[in-house]
């Protein structure tokens, strides 16, 4: 009889351990759900505010056709400028046409006047070729006017209505570019 009671007690204890384990799993699952819910809500809020805003470009960005442009208010070297643009989901400005160049230089005149602004153009150290950041070549009319005498890496910048070149380690403002959001209306 004592053996029987002992066996029942062990079975009960085993059951209790299983229930504790189940409770622990449930608590863990609940916490995981709550966490996912929090992420979900944040994502939804983000999406809703974007939808509510429904502007093709973020605040403080300028729109021209399918592009949005951000003119920085801080100076940085070319590589840091590139990273600053990436943080915003954009790249350094890539000028595709004379029309785009005219829009940029016209906007800069209105905003800030005659300063230097890094764009996404750099010169390959070996070949001396100018290339945009996506690897494409600039059109002939959009090559930097003066060849920099720097022994270091050379990058392109916009000043007034010209495209010029300079040592990439100098400090300048910069311009980021991304696609404008299409309105779904």
């Amino acid at each position: 009889k004592l053996l029987q009671v002992s066996t029942i007690a062990m079975q009960q204890q085993e059951k209790l351990i299983q229930q504790e384990r189940a409770l622990l799993n449930f608590t863990e699952w609940k916490r995981s759900c709550a966490l996912q819910m929090k992420y979900c809500q944040a994502f939804m809020q983000n999406s809703l505010s974007s939808a509510h805003n429904s502007s093709p470009c973020p605040n403080n960005w300028i729109q021209n056709r399918e592009s949005c442009y951000y003119v920085s208010e801080i100076w940085s070297i070319w590589h840091t400028s590139q990273e600053n643009c990436l943080k915003e989901g954009s790249t350094l400005l890539q000028i595709e046409s004379k029309e785009e160049m005219d829009f940029i230089t016209g906007s800069l005149r209105k905003i800030k006047g005659s300063y230097d602004y890094w764009v996404g153009l750099s010169q390959d150290g070996h070949s001396g070729r100018w290339l945009w950041q996506d690897g494409s070549s600039p059109s002939p009319g959009l090559l930097p006017a003066e060849r920099s005498q720097s022994a270091n890496q050379v990058c392109g910048y916009v000043k007034s209505n010209s495209l010029l070149s300079s040592n990439c380690s100098t400090w300048k403002y910069f311009i980021c570019e991304k696609y404008a959001l299409r309105s779904s209306v």
């Epitope: 990436l86 943080k87 790249t91």
Partner: nanobody, 115 residues
């Protein structure tokens, strides 16, 4: 936080190819762009290639025409296709997620180009 896991590194002969992968998980909705950096022994970490959420790529001069960055449709995984590899491409390659706030790094994967 955003977690990044790289894979695909290894030993390859000069002129050969490798494809690196970086899988992101966690708060991926806060990520605006993803990129690959590399660090060779005794050198500074440098940006190799990056791609924005909109799919716009950017490359370092030294890899233009040889490396291609891409992402899957979900945007959670980024790939770096490396062709015509040279001994000077030998380095630890790190994946990075760009957000408005913090930047997140992977642990790195070693790429060795040697005959």
């Amino acid at each position: 936080d955003v977690q990044l896991v790289e894979s695909g590194g290894g030993l390859v002969q000069p002129g050969g190819s490798l494809r690196l992968s970086c899988a992101a998980s966690g708060r991926i909705f806060s990520v605006n762009a993803m990129g690959w950096y590399r660090q060779a022994p005794g050198k500074q970490r440098e940006l190799v290639a990056a791609i924005t959420n909109q799919g716009a790529p950017t490359y370092a001069d030294s890899v233009k025409g040889r490396f291609t960055i891409s992402r899957d449709n979900s945007g959670n995984t980024v790939y770096l296709q490396m062709n015509s590899l040279r001994p000077e491409d030998t380095a630890v390659y790190y994946c990075k997620a760009f957000t408005r706030g913090d930047d997140y790094w992977g642990q790195g994967t070693l790429v060795t180009v040697s005959s």
